[in-house]
């Protein structure tokens, strides 16, 4: 066959669908690879062809569109399963071609099983809700296009394994689930089961997402430097190890980049000719507030090093702060035989 622009296996689109449920999969060519849509391609006389490679096989084979009850069908740029079976797992290819043009892309499709509590190997989207906030909603995802607007599906929501009914702080409202209050106890998986009729059959769509309750933006503050502080003096003798922790608290802020860094005499440690190492550790609270600790370490400090300025800096979307560490050279304790004896006038 003539040359075809092969975009390879699009592993960015790791599509997972539940067994025994409808699935509609759009050909990725029009979404990510080509600058025109299906309608334009179709008008230009291009044909969309589908084929697949079964799991653990190398042989590409055409998709059987003549199964009973049209279990697998194609509609425009969408491949339909009504419903999926476990052995539909494999790599699917959509190819757009005519006599002079050819472009194709493959993508993996995994049909997964779920248990009665909706546990499965499915990768779940995470939805963050704010603590101490007003009413917040999550929406049943990826159900568009499965049924026409004239069809009124029934939607049942679950928290983990529990059907959400008369909950104190969570109210199902069709495709939405409203949280009157979001508690840390609300962390976990929420599932909507959408049931709709089609051609005398009943289909179910199961969609699970993870809710994570995080700090509220109205409680967010600029970074707080707990250490260094004015109460601690780093007093060292030359040759000793100097260890200064910089500990910073960051309020949770959606999409904020939290940064901590040291300067020595106003320069980055890399730009100073001394042997400095910096180790960082990060911990998170239950609401994803963050505490970062950067420990500045000089193995054998010199008297010159003890005269330098050591400043810890922190920055988030809420602002930037800095705090200097108080570093001093320890005054050696007097040695009795010489200093004290001389002091007492001994000869």
């Amino acid at each position: 066959s003539e040359r075809c622009d092969d975009w390879g296996l699009d592993t960015m689109r790791q599509i997972q669908v539940f067994e025994d449920e409808p699935a509609r999969i759009k050909c990725p060519l029009f979404e990510h690879f080509l600058k025109f849509n299906y309608s334009t391609a179709h008008s230009a006389g291009l044909t969309l062809i589908w084929y697949w490679t079964r799991q653990d096989r190398d042989l590409e084979e055409p998709i059987n569109f003549r199964l009973p009850e049209n279990r697998i069908s194609k509609e425009k740029d969408v491949l339909w399963f009504r419903p999926t079976l476990l052995n539909d797992t494999g790599n699917y290819t959509c190819m757009l071609r005519n006599t002079t043009y050819c472009s194709k892309v493959a993508f993996p499709l995994e049909v997964v099983q779920k248990d009665s509590c909706f546990n499965s190997p499915m990768k779940l989207p995470v939805h963050k809700l704010y603590i101490e906030y007003g009413i917040q909603r999550i929406t049943c995802p990826n159900v568009d296009g499965y049924f026409p607007s004239s069809v009124k599906p029934t939607i049942t929501w679950y928290m983990g394994c529990y059907k959400i009914q008369n909950f104190n702080n969570v109210i199902p409202e069709g495709m939405n689930l409203s949280f009157l209050i979001a508690f840390i106890s609300n962390n976990g998986n929420y599932t909507c089961v959408v049931t709709y009729p089609e051609n005398g059959r009943t289909f179910h769509l199961t969609r699970t997402l993870t809710v994570k309750v995080v700090g509220s933006p109205k409680n967010a503050v600029p970074p707080v430097i707990h250490s260094p502080n004015d109460h601690v003096v780093y007093e060292k003798e030359p040759g000793e190890e100097l260890l200064i922790p910089c500990t910073v608290y960051f309020s949770f802020l959606m999409d904020s980049r939290n940064e901590v860094w040291w300067t020595i005499d106003g320069k980055k440690p890399d730009d100073i000719p001394i042997d400095v190492t910096i180790n960082e550790s990060i911990s998170h609270s239950r609401t994803e507030d963050e505490t970062r600790t950067q420990i500045l370490s000089i193995k054998k400090v010199t008297s010159e090093d003890l005269k330098r300025s050591y400043v810890c800096h922190a920055r988030s979307a809420k602002g930037e702060v800095a705090k200097a560490a108080t570093v001093k050279q320890k005054v050696p304790a007097p040695r009795y035989t010489v200093e004290l004896a001389c002091g007492f006038g001994a000869t």
């Epitope: 009413i135 394994c161 529990y162 008369n166 909950f167 209050i181 508690f183 840390i184």
Partner: antibody, heavy 119, light 107 residues
């Protein structure tokens, strides 16, 4: 530390009205919601009503729905329970309690105020 | 409404005893359960939330466990100040409901 102090209890005739207050001292209410809980003499605790901190949505127990109204005045840091069409079975100590914002729990309680409905 | 059933209703024990109170919910409430202590003429005091988390300032001899429909409150070594009535409280389903109480009295 916030403290809650109830007032407004007393003796009232059946069919009468009473307004209970719950004032927060030492800070604002905070939390996710404010609740009223009652306890009839020698009996257990019974939840009566709540009002959400954000949005002000009110919820009631079936036994008081249509008769009791919960409200709050944030400027005065005070929670109210307006009780109308009182019945003998409403006789109880009424507590206000704060619902925590982190976890479902009533973490601060007032000392209670006694409401007696009797002719 | 969810029924919260505590057992026993009354419990006679001595200082130093290990005491266990059970609370059963008529339907699953996950871990949305709290325990309170109440002394005569006083307001309830929060001991345990989220079924097993100890409220700040509460002695570590108090502990909670359970999930779903079966929950327990345990006092590992009863102290004189622990003689009181204890209530479980479910906060998942509307309306909030409490157990009928368990009175811990001196044997």
């Amino acid at each position: 530390e916030v403290q809650l102090v109830e007032s407004g209890g007393g003796l009232v005739q059946p069919g009468g009205s009473l307004r209970l207050s719950c004032a927060a001292s030492g800070g604002t209410f905070g939390g996710s919601a404010m609740h009223w809980v009652r306890q009839a003499p020698g009996k257990g605790l019974v939840w009566v009503s709540r009002i959400l901190t954000y949005g002000g949505i009110a919820t009631y127990a079936e036994s008081v729905k249509g008769r009791f109204t919960i409200s709050r005045d944030n400027a005065k840091n005070t929670l109210y329970l307006q009780m109308n069409s009182l019945r003998a079975e409403d006789t109880a100590v009424y507590y206000c309690a704060r619902g925590s914002s982190e976890y479902p729990k009533f973490d601060i309680w007032g000392q209670g105020t006694l409401v007696t409905v009797s002719s | 409404d969810i029924q919260m059933t505590q057992s026993p209703s009354t419990l006679s024990a001595s200082v130093g005893d290990r005491v266990t109170i059970t609370c059963r919910a008529s339907q699953s409430i996950s871990s949305w359960l709290a325990w309170y202590q109440q002394k005569p003429g006083k307001a309830p005091k929060l001991l345990i939330y989220d079924a097993s988390s100890l409220e700040s300032g509460v002695p570590s001899r108090f502990s909670g466990s359970g999930s779903g429909t079966e929950f327990t409150l345990t006092i590992s070594s009863l102290q004189p100040e622990d003689f009181a009535t204890y209530y479980c409280h479910q906060l998942l389903i509307y309306p909030h409901t409490f157990g009928q109480g368990t009175k811990v009295e001196i044997k």
